[in-house]
């Protein structure tokens, strides 16, 4: 911490300007009034203070606002935001999307830091839900943001916000997250026609149940293999060979290359071999002809 010393004669800061970069830390502490700093925060970002000097300015603001900074100051923190700890940020009440954008801009191009994660958490909690504008902003800065949320947190995303989601935003989502997002996407896109609907829903299909996949198979969608491989295994298993053929269209030939990988491998094991043979792909491992398949899970449910 900077020692308290009297400000040298003639060095008292009348405004926040470029001349202050020549001040040593102790001079900044002694010669810059915290209230002046707070009212002229918008100037700080344009002045190339060193990180050590920014520490001093932060200390002055902390003394002025021990309960947390007002939004008028937060919005103009700029590089000073990089000096904030998650504990500092938890004291803030950030309500303006413009403030959020300004602070995310400072961290642009870097991984999401604990400070940014705390800021986003405070902002979203303050709003009560992840609305479309917020989601638009967050995924623009952090494409993986959506997949960093727990299924519980995702449940607060309104279907209308799903329009802001791009395919790359879902790249790192796991099946539990897609289970939550898929029904919202289905609702959001329900009024679109077949081919447009499929383009929009495609990235969410890792959360789709069997009945929706069956319905899609009737619509000539020509699902690519990459999408098919991301489907839930339990949703794929009940599909018939004919349904998979219709679902994939010309891409059905790609099954051969994926026959050892889930969900294709597990699906093959559930199909009759003579049905698989109709595809003409040389898929092996189906149920031999003449064998009877007993669904024991069904039997247990009945008894």
């Amino acid at each position: 911490e900077v020692e308290k010393t009297a400000c040298p004669s003639g060095k008292k800061a009348r405004e926040i300007d470029e001349s202050l970069i020549f001040y040593k830390k102790w001079e900044l502490e002694a010669c810059v009034d915290a209230a002046l700093l707070a009212t002229q925060m918008d100037r700080v970002n344009a002045i190339p203070f060193t990180y050590e000097q920014l520490d001093v300015l932060k200390h002055k603001l902390d003394e002025l606002y021990p309960q947390g900074y007002p939004e008028s100051v937060i919005q103009h923190l700029g590089y000073l935001f990089l000096k904030m700890s998650p504990e500092d940020i938890r004291k803030w009440n950030v309500t303006s999307l413009e403030t959020l954008k300004a602070l995310l801009e400072v961290n642009k191009g870097h991984e999401m830091s604990p400070q940014v994660a705390t800021l986003i958490d405070r902002f979203v909690k303050g709003r009560g839900q992840l609305d479309k504008d917020t989601l638009d902003t967050l995924t623009a800065f952090y494409p993986g943001y959506l997949c960093s949320l727990s299924p519980e947190e995702l449940s607060s995303v309104p279907p209308s916000s799903i329009w802001a989601v791009r395919p790359q935003d879902l790249d790192t989502c796991d099946p539990r997250q897609l289970d939550v997002l898929y029904p919202k996407a289905r609702l959001a896109f329900q009024n679109m026609n077949g081919s447009e609907y499929f383009v929009k829903i495609q990235s969410f299909l890792g959360g789709a149940p069997t009945e929706d996949l069956k319905a899609l198979s009737q619509q000539n969608v020509s699902m690519d293999l990459a999408t098919f491989m991301k489907l839930r295994t339990d949703a794929v298993l009940p599909l018939t060979v004919a349904e998979v053929q219709k679902l994939l269209g010309p891409h059905v030939e790609g099954l051969k290359a994926e026959e050892r990988h889930r969900p294709v491998r597990d699906w093959i094991l559930r199909q009759r071999q003579d049905d698989l043979d109709t595809l003409g792909l040389g898929l092996q491992g189906g149920i031999p002809n003449g064998y009877l398949v007993l669904d024991l899970s069904m039997q247990e449910a009945l008894s």
Partner: nanobody
């Protein structure tokens, strides 16, 4: 990768002159504002002088009239001409892009002024 190599330091008597050089690479030199910082033993980092991309210069009060900053864009080099040196100018001098915000850090070049 941004690289800045300072040179020209040494030991001199009070009242003498030294010229420090800083050769830059890894960034667009002529678009950058540059600065010379110094740190005396047991003291804190201090900005000595800056030169902006348009050539305008600024100095700390303690060196005004004695030090001159300049740059040669063709050589990607910034200079600090130090005249009428005083013992209190003894420090490690470092050059930086002002945008880096890191002040006194790294190797630098040592200037020792004896009375």
């Amino acid at each position: 990768e941004v690289q800045l190599v300072e040179s020209g330091g040494g030991s001199v008597q009070a009242g003498e002159t030294l010229q420090l050089s800083c050769t830059a690479s890894g960034f667009t030199f002529d678009d950058s504002d540059m600065g010379w910082y110094r740190q005396a033993p047991g003291d804190e980092c201090e900005l000595v002088s800056t030169i902006s991309s348009d050539g305008s210069t600024n100095y700390a009060d303690s060196v005004k009239g004695r030090f001159t900053i300049s740059q040669d864009n063709a050589k990607n080099t910034v200079y600090l001409q130090m005249t009428s040196l005083k013992p209190e100018d003894t420090a490690i001098y470092s050059c930086r892009t002002m945008a880096s915000r890191i002040g006194c850090w790294g190797q630098g070049t040592l200037v020792t002024v004896s009375s």
